[in-house]
């Protein structure tokens, strides 16, 4: 498909800043125009682009889900940063949702790591020091976790 094959049509929208592409690419915070001659700014708080690009459209800003807090808002050059609320965490293998951290370790285990926005509490066997596999125990001790504070950017695009 040649560049000329695309015939864009843009409905009336609020006036957006334009600049010229450099070697066919537009800077972060912009997308390429209808005819490829202009760079059009993304809409603040609505969409964004992070790199030099030849995108027809800016990417939609992520909206933090319930159960998440917004650490930093979406700008034209950076997506929203979302983090799980205190007492919850997001696992790498299920990034769609925040899960509740366990409140304590199973009997015979001791807590060595707190609940953070990206990890559950960490438990090890008192004697051997081996880690607990992570399934919710039938009986828990009263060791409680304290939430961590560092930021974890939201990995989802929407």
């Amino acid at each position: 498909i040649t560049q000329q094959d695309l015939a864009p049509q843009q409905r009336a929208a609020p006036q957006q800043k334009r600049s010229s592409p450099s070697e066919g690419l537009c800077p972060p915070g912009h997308h390429i125009s209808e005819d490829g001659r202009d760079c059009i700014s993304c809409k603040y708080g609505q969409d964004y682009s992070t790199h030099w690009n030849d995108l027809l459209f800016c990417l939609r800003c992520t909206r933090c889900d319930s159960g998440e807090v917004e650490l930093s808002p979406c700008t034209t050059t950076r997506n929203t940063v979302c983090q799980c609320e205190e007492g919850t965490f997001r696992e790498e293998d299920s990034p769609e949702m925040c899960r509740k951290c366990r409140t304590g370790c199973p009997r015979g285990m001791v807590k060595v790591g707190d609940c953070t926005p990206w990890s559950d509490i960490e438990c090890v066997h008192k004697e051997s020091g081996t880690k607990h596999s992570g399934e919710v125990p039938a009986v828990e001790e009263t060791v409680t976790s304290s939430p961590g504070t560092p930021a974890s950017p939201c990995s989802l695009s929407g």
Partner: nanobody, 122 residues
Framework: EVQLLESGGGEVQPGGSLRLSCAAS????????MGWFRQAPGKDREFVSA????????YYAESVKGRFTISRDNAKNTLYLQMSSLRAEDTAVYYC?????????????????WGQGTLVTV
């Protein structure tokens, strides 16, 4: 994970009209730009049309401009392609795609998902 299912294809006389639909299931596609592509027998897949996540900016290949109209209903998680003044050269399998964006030239950018296609014969 997003699943896309096209429908509405079929046989039509030259000059006739068809409306293709693409129903999305799984994760909502309201965050994604969406597009239509087509592949004629013995040819490469080509870009037809795309629109942004909000549905307010559309692009068309020159070959379909003025004849095809792309639209979306985010509430129904559905993409449409209204095709009119159809020609023999429009005969192809039409595919729906959802992507974070599309590059100039039509290539999908970022996460992207594809349907299985629906055959249009003119």
């Amino acid at each position: 994970e997003v699943q896309l299912l096209e429908s509405g294809g079929g046989e039509v006389q030259p000059g006739g009209s068809l409306r293709l639909s693409c129903a999305a299931s799984g994760r909502t596609v309201s965050n994604y730009a969406m597009g239509w592509f087509r592949q004629a027998p013995g040819k490469d897949r080509e870009f037809v049309s795309a629109l942004n996540w909000g549905g307010d900016t559309t692009y068309y290949a020159e070959s379909v401009k003025g004849r095809f109209t792309i639209s979306r209903d985010n509430a129904k998680n559905t993409l449409y392609l209204q095709m009119s003044s159809l020609r023999a050269e429009d005969t192809a399998v039409y595919y729906c795609a959802a992507a974070q964006s599309f590059r100039r030239g039509g290539a999908p950018y970022g996460d992207n998902y594809w349907g299985q296609g629906t055959l249009v014969t003119v």
